[in-house]
């Protein structure tokens, strides 16, 4: 149950409701969760976490990454900078996210749940950031044609891209959420 | 299962340099954060410097800023920390960690590899 | 930087006893809270992670409590093998800070 959702919470009156920056945390470390148990599935499935032939698949994804101009590491940490990358981040992940759905047996629930958490904590980050202006979403077009280039691959590539998708996913989620307890 | 092996340790004059390194296995390296713990003899352990799993993003203590370098080598599994302008207050056993798959504890640990910095 | 405090320093007690650590953050840390072994000579050794959550392999008389500033490692039933200095950590935000440490010895 994502947080916030729980009906425990309903029941207990007395507990101070969430601060803003504390649902936000409370949300990764839900997609975080998730991602670690989509992690297994994919480790026990495959041997793609033992590969070394990533580059192969990483030279068909273009995934969001943290770097240092976006002001979300320590040095040059600037916190309207990196809420806008974060943002931005989390808007382009949402393609793969969407690739993720059908990639997994027993965790079907599980990637819809990252997928659908992900869509609630872009917009907890979009209600606290300033410059909107800033943040520029993917165009739909080359999304879905890049999701079709993605689906068409092989069955080792498209095992690749999914174990590549969850490592990257949660670089960015972790990096995200040093960031915003930095806020 | 998963082993962290420190190197480089020894005995250096202040203001001196010490390049100290870790070799990793048991695991997939490039799924984690990794960092550098110390501890000066009888004292409290120290977070020094931790490094993000592709390498792209660090973090240091305040008192090691612009003097010590993480970096990492996923190519060879391993992790390393240079250390320039030593002072005496770095005497330290330096222990290379795994960070948790998604949280910032320490879950492994090496043996560690003591520097001395005295002349 | 977050301040951890740890009491008692030091603590002697016997085997079979059950002996409580307390760890207090100088501000919230949810329950972003670790706790290790450490004997001398050898690298520490993470016990519970998550304020409460034990990590695998560790025996169940080791137990965490607490949440927000607040924090208890509890051992149950003192084993000969747990004399040793038990440090908490917050994992909370960066700089990592530990506790100075409890030394548990033996009465």
């Known amino acids: 149950v994502p947080p916030g959702e729980d009906s425990k919470d309903v029941a207990a009156p007395h507990r101070q409701p969430l601060t803003s920056s504390e649902r936000i945390d409370k949300q990764i470390r839900y997609i975080l969760d998730g991602i670690s148990a989509l992690r297994k599935e994919t480790c026990n499935k495959s041997n793609m976490c033992e590969s070394s032939k990533e580059a192969l698949a990483e030279n068909n994804l273009n995934l969001p990454k943290m770097a240092e101009k976006d002001g979300c590491f320590q040095s040059g940490f600037n916190e309207e900078t990196c809420l806008v990358k974060i943002i931005t981040g989390l808007l382009e992940f949402e393609v793969y996210l969407e690739y993720l759905q059908n990639r997994f047996e027993s965790s079907e629930e599980q990637a819809r749940a990252v997928q659908m958490s992900t869509k609630v904590l872009i917009q907890f980050l979009q209600k606290k950031a300033k410059n909107l202006d800033a943040i520029t979403t993917p165009d739909p077009t080359t999304n879905a044609s890049l999701l079709t280039k993605l689906q068409a691959q092989n069955q080792w590539l498209q095992d690749m891209t999914t174990h590549l998708i969850l490592r990257s996913f949660k670089e960015f989620l972790q990096s995200s959420l040093r960031a915003l307890r930095q806020m | 299962e998963v082993q962290l092996v420190e190197s480089g340790g020894g005995l250096v004059q202040p203001g001196g340099s010490l390049r100290l390194s870790c070799a990793a296995s048991g695991f997939t390296f490039n799924d984690y954060d990794m960092a550098w713990v110390r501890q000066a003899p009888g004292k409290c352990l120290e977070w020094v410097a931790s490094i993000t799993p592709s390498g792209g993003g660090t973090y240091y203590r305040d008192s090691v800023k612009g003097r010590f370098t993480i970096s990492r080598d996923n190519a060879k599994n391993s992790l390393y920390l240079q250390m320039n302008s030593l002072r005496a207050e770095d005497t330290a056993v330096y222990y290379c960690?795994?960070?948790?798959?998604?949280?910032?504890?320490?879950?492994?640990w090496g043996q560690g590899t003591m520097v001395t910095v005295s002349s | 930087d977050i301040q951890m405090t740890q009491s008692p320093s030091s603590l002697s007690a016997s085997v079979g006893d059950r002996v409580t650590i307390t760890c207090l953050a100088s501000e919230g840390i949810s329950n972003d809270l670790a706790w290790y072994q450490q004997k001398p000579g050898k690298a520490p050794k993470l016990l519970i992670y998550d304020a409460t959550r034990l990590q695998d392999g560790v025996p169940s008389r080791f137990s965490g409590s607490g949440s927000g500033t607040d924090f208890t490692l509890t051992i149950s039933s003192l084993q000969p093998e747990d004399f040793a200095t038990y440090y908490c950590q917050q994992s909370y935000k960066y700089p990592w800070t530990f506790g100075c440490g409890t030394k548990l010895e033996i009465k």
């Open positions: 960690a795994r960070h948790g798959y998604t949280l910032d504890y320490f879950e492994y």
